[in-house]
Amino acid sequence: FSGSEATAAILSRAPWSLQSVNPGLKTNSSKEPKFTKCRSPERETFSCHWTDEVHHGTKNLGPIQLFYTRRNTQEWTQEWKECPDYVSAGENSCYFNSSFTSIWIPYCIKLTSNGGTVDEKCFSVDEIVQPDPPIALNWTLLNVSLTGIHADIQVRWEAPRNADIQKGWMVLEYELQYKEVNETKWKMMDPILTTSVPVYSLKVDKEYEVRVRSKQRNSGNYGEFSEVLYVTLPQMSQFTCEEDFY
């Protein structure tokens, strides 16, 4: 989970505080509900998810509710408000649409049951940005070595549809990984800011898997990987070698 931990005691501190508060103040046990993740795909909405193991067991804690408070020196002293939407992000979740989301203020969220706080987190939206996967992966052949053993390809993709790249609201950096189909370990390329990259010196007789993920530059975490792109490089005889033209 990205962001700082806090407890209800945060409200007795500086109201703009996002720092950790003594975790000993919590009554949390491993069986009680806990936040598992908050995520914003595009800096304009976010959702938070939690575990709810206890409701599948014998102990009945009562209904789990999420409350949030936001902003700083003024509004922080107001009452906590309940989750605006328990449905849209799935089970055990709360969804904050664009009306409830701003990157310019801190948020604190808490889970309650029977009136007691069981978990609490504080964060800013940029810290929880995890973009959707890049889409439309494809590749083209750049060239083949003189020996016909290796080839270079160019891999291209598009930013996730919901990422506002044009206006610069999101600046994404991408990480491409590739491996031979029968290998287990992925080779990672250095992060780049463009939506295409050459991959050099692939073995011509092998099949490769390529995947790409992205993160907001300077903040947040990498999102999920794209669907795998399969690259099959046929044997040398199937290529027209550029040297044939000289």
Partner: antibody, heavy 115, light 108 residues
Framework: EVQLVESGGGLVKPGGSLRLSCAAS????????MDWVRQAPGKGLEWVAE??????????YYAESVKGRFTISRDDSKNTLYLQMNSLKTEDTAVYYC??????WGQGTLVTVSS | EIVLTQSPGTLSLSPGERATLSCTAT???????LNWYQQKPGQAPRLLIY???NLASGIPDRFSGSGSGTDFTLTISRLEPEDFAVYYC?????????FGGGTKVEIK
């Protein structure tokens, strides 16, 4: 009581540099998100930059008009906010306000960029 | 960037009158993220109203705010002599934080 006191303003030539300081008191500075906002003479307000708390990784944000020229920073041990201004232009002439996330404001310090 | 346009540029009124100031955004702003400030000559701006309609600490209740979407309003029910000043709206919802150009409320 929140108090913010800016200093470091003055007259500087185009292309020159200046560092503004803001001494903060009356709140837990290390927990605070801090901003600089400026106001050109007889004009409106323009947000310049923001720096967040250590808990938020001291993340920084800038207006397009100052990106690459201005640097916001802080020293939590001294309860002080800074704005390093390089490659100054005449259009940077303004009163610069230090603010606690635009809720509480200092009295401002005047920066004049002129040859 | 969201541009905030304030109107009128100047409002000439007498003490005791009602003042209505307008702030229009180029695209929708959530009411949670719109503030109003008051600035007197030679002074720093002071937060008046936050989240469209909430009075900041120490602000008298003759000030009120309303609106949603792209249109927001600051109302001063009965102008007091100390209310003659410049008023700015401010959004921090989308894009970078922006301020309106200001409305000057002057004595008629």
């Amino acid at each position: 009581e929140v108090q913010l006191v800016e200093s470091g303003g003055g007259l500087v030539k185009p292309g020159g540099s200046l560092r503004l300081s803001c001494a903060a008191s009356g709140f837990t500075f290390s927990d605070a998100w801090m901003d600089w906002v400026r106001q050109a003479p007889g004009k409106g307000l323009e947000w310049v930059a923001e720096i967040r708390s250590k808990a938020n990784y001291h993340a920084t944000y800038y207006a397009e008009s100052v990106k690459g020229r201005f640097t916001i920073s802080r020293d939590d041990s001294k309860n002080t906010l800074y704005l390093q201004m390089n490659s100054l232009k005449t259009e940077d002439t303004a009163v610069y306000y230090c603010t606690l996330i635009r809720d509480y404001w200092g009295q401002g310090t005047l920066v004049t960029v002129s040859s | 960037e969201i541009v905030l346009t304030q109107s009128p540029g100047t409002l000439s009124l007498s003490p005791g009158e009602r003042a209505t100031l307008s702030c229009t955004a180029t695209s929708s702003v959530s009411s949670s993220y719109l503030n109003w400030y008051q600035q007197k000559p030679g002074q720093a701006p002071r937060l008046l109203i936050y989240s469209t309609s909430n009075l900041a600490s120490g602000i008298p209740d003759r000030f009120s705010g309303s609106g949603s979407g792209t249109d927001f309003t600051l109302t001063i029910s009965r102008l007091e002599p100390e209310d003659f000043a410049v008023y700015y709206c401010h959004q921090y919802h989308r894009s970078t934080p922006t301020f309106g150009g200001g409305t000057k409320v002057e004595i008629k």
